[in-house]
């Protein structure tokens, strides 16, 4: 569910939302760290209705959710916490 990608692309998110999305409607969360042409961290959420939204990394709900997912991933080894995609 939680993925970190390192890409050579510039920023992917034109607009960010802080609107709450419950975990039950989230399919996948992709984290794009700062760097490689983008000066900010980006969080992309794939929803279960196939739509995609960029979420403000400062939104409290996404920070809480990522912490829960990290804990959950680390307690269910051998599933990796992060998937790395090397360009």
């Amino acid at each position: 569910v939680l993925e970190v990608y390192y890409t050579s692309l510039r920023c992917r998110c034109v607009q960010e939302s802080s609107v709450f999305i419950p975990r039950r409607f989230i399919d996948r969360i992709q984290i794009l760290p700062r760097g490689n042409g983008c000066p900010r961290k980006e969080i992309i959420v794939w929803k279960k209705n196939k739509s995609i939204v960029c979420v403000d990394p400062q939104a409290e709900w996404i920070q809480r959710m990522m912490e829960v997912l990290r804990k959950r991933s680390s307690s269910t080894l051998p599933v990796p916490v992060f998937k790395r995609k090397i360009p």
């Epitope: 609107v19 709450f20 975990r23 039950r24 279960k48 209705n49 409290e60 709900w61 959950r72």
Partner: antibody, heavy 123, light 106 residues
């Protein structure tokens, strides 16, 4: 006091269409997601659809996807369910329910429910 | 899709008895389970959410426990007004209800 009142149920032939409505009061309607849940006669509960507080996102289980459409009018405090290509197995009492608080961080499920409206699909 | 297996499907108990209903999820749902009470001809009423959080106004004789895939709903001392059908609901991944437990008085 939170109140949800469904209407629009009735008898419809297989293949037909019906539009259900739910009038909400007693809370800030535009701050909450809303859902429809159904219950076939003598059977259990089954989730049908959910719409986000602003109406931009809708979610459905596979068995109604493409046939049912959930929508809302926040100015009228109203929720709707458009049901097309109805089948005998869609016969049920349809409940509207208040869902998660859109401005919150905590995840809670459907908390308040209406009394339901009966939809009968039969020839 | 997540399946919720609720048991028993029906049970008979006496006033004052401790009553336990279980729900088993087909995969880990963390603590995202709720319990509803439905009386004949009425709408479901939320009793408990997030496994053990009591909805305001719900008597303290109702409680919930569990995590992961196994969950329990308990009525510590059955009252006549508790006669109803009880449903669990997982809301970790979309929504799935359990099949229900019809509770009757002996």
């Amino acid at each position: 006091e939170v109140q949800l009142v469904e209407s629009g149920g009735g008898l419809v032939q297989p293949g037909g269409s019906l539009r259900l409505s739910c009038a909400a009061s007693g809370f800030t309607f535009s701050s909450y997601a809303m859902s429809w849940v159904r219950q076939a006669p003598g059977k259990g509960l089954e989730w049908v659809a959910t719409i986000s507080e602003g109406g931009s996102d809708a979610y459905y289980p596979d068995n109604v996807k493409g046939r049912f459409t959930i929508s809302r009018d926040n100015a009228k405090n109203s929720l709707y369910l458009q049901m097309n290509s109805l089948r005998a197995e869609d016969t049920a009492v349809y409940y509207c329910a208040r869902d998660y608080y859109g401005s919150g961080y905590e995840e809670s499920p459907m908390d308040y429910w209406g009394q339901g409206t009966l939809v009968t699909v039969s020839s | 899709d997540i399946q919720m297996t609720q048991s028993p499907s029906s049970l008979s108990a006496s006033v004052g008895d401790r009553v336990t209903i279980t729900c088993k999820a087909s995969q880990d749902i963390n603590k995202y389970i709720a319990w509803y009470q439905q009386k004949p001809g009425k709408a479901p009423k939320l009793l408990i959410y997030y496994t053990s959080t009591l909805q305001p106004g719900v008597p303290s004789r109702f409680s919930g426990s569990g995590s992961g895939t196994d969950f329990t709903f308990t009525i510590s001392s059955l009252q006549p007004e508790d006669i109803a059908t009880y449903y669990c609901l997982q809301y970790d991944n979309l929504y799935t209800f359990g099949g229900g437990t019809k509770l009757e008085i002996k």
